[in-house]
Interface confidence: low
């Protein structure tokens, strides 16, 4: 390998490098790569050099390219016809000279916060892109369509977001924002403008019409109407609050839709209960004020009894099968009929069948194995399902089982 | 006074298996939503599973869904966790815990809590 | 995902706030000292469990959630969890190691 490396001379964004050959193993050196290395890259870099291609006689390269302020190791690898060698020992650590910054801060952009707070937030500027020390940035803002900037400075690399308080702040207004940088060496450049808002004010008007229905002994559908009135605060959604009559009010559950849906279905209930619910539209300020309460009580459980007595028989490529009628108990849903779930051992998807009797008859081919479940159905949703039913694949036309 | 003791933990290999109990006292056991949430040593608190009083809903973390089942048996004032398929990252102190209120629901309101019992996955 | 500063330090006496950031229908508080159970100081945004101080106290607004001790004391030092649900997953926030100096 090439002995090591020396740093002759160092700006900036250059370094003036020079190193001794090593021996050649006999066949002649054709070139040398200079490679570099920071505390922020992943191992060793081949980095751009004067002259671009570095013969087997130049010992001197300058390296261009460098971030300012950044510490640098350099190293050399010499190579000929037969391959490349071995890398020459690093280069003692050295850092750039210090420059105006150039980078900008990514992703200006902000927005929510508290009354009369104007939060503007971006993405901090990398270390090895800060060009010097003593690093920060200047927050400018200005309401959209005014002449003048405000001006903030943050002398921190660190800082990612600035809260602007003033009661002069409109709820939900447009600004103007740009995000610039500075370093000991003075100001470098502004982000692009953006337009950011100031904070909302939370809705001032209720839900209106809401209205709520059963639709099984778990779940409950709930509509309701945009409010009457023309809010102040946007809508960004609307947030649902249940409880059990027996229950507290401030121990509701929640759930909140988002944009204009105006309905929502709440799931997971208990059977013959009694919910009341009210509505609030919400944004990124807070809730608005909620609407009527309304009352709805959730349908009785579905049959707890499962179909038994299961028979099944089969001849000329159809099954019938036969079960026991369901007897829903007094504190359960009437069963309006079954449904008999059906698929071949090998496939994932399961086919279903409706019913009002307790036989059905199945046309199948015969040359797959069948898991079949029955289960009833009412108004309280899906009663409890048998065992499953194994029938094995059919090679003669006539076959039972239960 | 309300006591919740867990017990079950233990030493399991990867992939293996273990049921965690908790027996409770103090309160109607039936009224209250209870759970399960577990904290890996020098970590913070992670919500592992929740079920209703009557236990005919259960809601379950990501992490562990499809390998934990959540249930309780209200005669006895038990709860319980079926743990399978285990992995070393369900290493944790497992606490049995209970809701705030009759409704009150999810991590926003667990009011009591058990000592915790130690489970740790390693082969 | 609930997210809170990891660490937050206040003078003997002094007020404290430790904020939570995510969303949530609603927000609790958890007390946690080394090797012991937590034990929950605030639930559902604001409410305070019996036998809690009254210089614990809790508010939510919007997507953010604080906890204030006002004229924290000695005992208070712990580490302190936010809690929370949204749709039908519950969640805690990572933490925040209060020191009082």
């Known amino acids: 390998p090439p002995e090591a490396v020396t740093i002759d001379e160092i700006t900036d964004t250059t370094a003036q490098l020079s190193w001794r050959p090593g021996p050649d193993n006999h066949s002649p050196i054709t070139m040398y790569v200079i490679q570099a290395r920071t505390p922020f890259s992943v191992g060793w870099q081949a980095v751009s050099t004067v002259p671009e291609l570095i013969d087997g006689k130049t010992f001197t390269a300058t390296v261009v390219g460098l971030n300012p302020w950044v510490e640098y190791e350099f190293r050399t690898v010499a190579a000929n016809v037969i391959g490349i060698g071995e890398p020459s020992r690093p280069s003692e650590k050295r850092r750039t000279e210090e420059a105006l910054p150039e980078v900008t801060p990514a992703n200006v952009s902000g927005g929510g916060g508290s009354k009369s707070e104007l939060v503007i937030t971006w993405e901090t500027v990398p270390e090895e892109l800060q060009n010097g020390r003593g690093f920060g940035y200047v927050v400018a803002f200005r309401p959209y369509g005014k002449m003048i900037w405000m001006l903030t400075v943050l002398a921190s690399a660190d800082a990612s977001r600035y809260v602007f308080r003033n009661e002069s702040v409109h709820p939900f207004s447009p600004f103007e924002v740009k995000v610039g940088v500075f370093n000991n060496k003075g100001e470098g450049p502004f982000s692009p403008t953006t337009v950011v808002y100031s904070a909302e004010e939370e809705p001032t008007k209720p839900p209106a019409s809401i209205f709520a229905r059963s639709l099984s002994a778990t779940d409950i559908e709930v509509f309701w109407a945009s409010p009457l009135e023309k809010n102040r605060g946007r809508i960004q959604g609307y947030e649902v609050k249940y409880w059990r009559h027996e229950d507290k009010e401030e121990n509701a559950r929640k759930i909140r839709t988002v944009g204009n849906q105006t309905s929502t279905k709440i799931t997971n209930l208990k059977g013959s209960v009694l919910y009341h619910l009210a509505v609030k539209a919400y944004n990124s300020a807070g809730t608005g004020p909620s609407s009527a309460t309304v009352n709805v009580t959730t349908r009785k459980p579905p049959p707890s009894q499962p179909p038994g007595n299961i028979i099944w028989n089969s001849s000329d490529s159809k099954i019938i099968l036969n079960w026991d009628q369901v007897k829903a108990l007094d504190n359960e849903s009437e069963v309006k009929g079954y449904k008999v779930l059906y698929r071949w051992n090998r496939q994932s998807s399961t086919s279903v069948i409706e019913t009002n009797k307790t036989s059905v008859e199945l046309s199948l081919p015969f040359d797959e194995d069948y898991i079949i479940e029955i289960k009833p159905f009412s108004d309280g949703g899906d009663g409890s399902s048998s065992e499953q039913i194994r029938i094995p694949k059919i090679s003669n036309a006539y076959a039972r089982g239960s | 006074e309300v006591q919740l003791l867990e017990s079950g933990g233990g030493l399991v290999q990867p992939g293996g298996s273990l049921r965690l109990s908790c027996a409770a006292s103090?309160?109607?056991?039936?009224?209250?939503?209870m759970f399960w949430v577990r904290q890996a040593p020098g970590k913070g608190l992670e919500w592992v599973a929740e079920?209703?009083?009557?236990?005919?809903?259960?809601w379950y973390a990501p992490a562990v869904k499809g390998r934990f089942t959540i249930s309780r048996d209200n005669s006895k004032n038990t709860l319980y966790l079926q743990m399978n398929s285990l992995r070393a990252e369900d290493t944790a102190v497992y606490y049995c815990?209970?809701?705030?209120?009759?409704?009150?629901?999810?991590?926003?309101?667990?009011?009591?809590w058990g000592q915790g019992t130690l489970v740790t996955v390693s082969s | 995902e609930l997210t809170q500063d990891p660490a937050v330090s206040v003078a003997l006496g002094q007020t404290v706030r430790i904020t939570c950031s995510g969303r949530?229908?609603?927000y609790g508080w958890y007390q946690q000292k080394p090797g012991q159970a937590p034990v929950l100081v605030i639930y559902?945004?604001?409410n305070r469990p019996s036998g809690i101080p009254d210089r614990f106290s809790g508010s939510s607004s919007g997507n953010t959630a604080s906890l204030t001790i006002t004229g924290a004391q000695a005992e208070d030092e712990a580490d302190y969890y936010c809690?929370?649900?949204?749709?039908?997953?519950?969640?805690f926030g990572g933490g925040t190691k209060l020191t009082v100096l």
């Open positions: 815990a209970k809701s705030a209120d009759t409704w009150s629901y999810g991590a926003a309101s667990i009011s009591a």
């Open positions: 103090g309160f109607t056991f039936s009224s209250f939503n």
């Open positions: 079920i209703s009083g009557g236990g005919g809903s259960t």
């Open positions: 949530s229908g609603s």
């Open positions: 559902d945004n604001t």
């Open positions: 809690g929370g649900y949204w749709g039908s997953t519950d969640v």
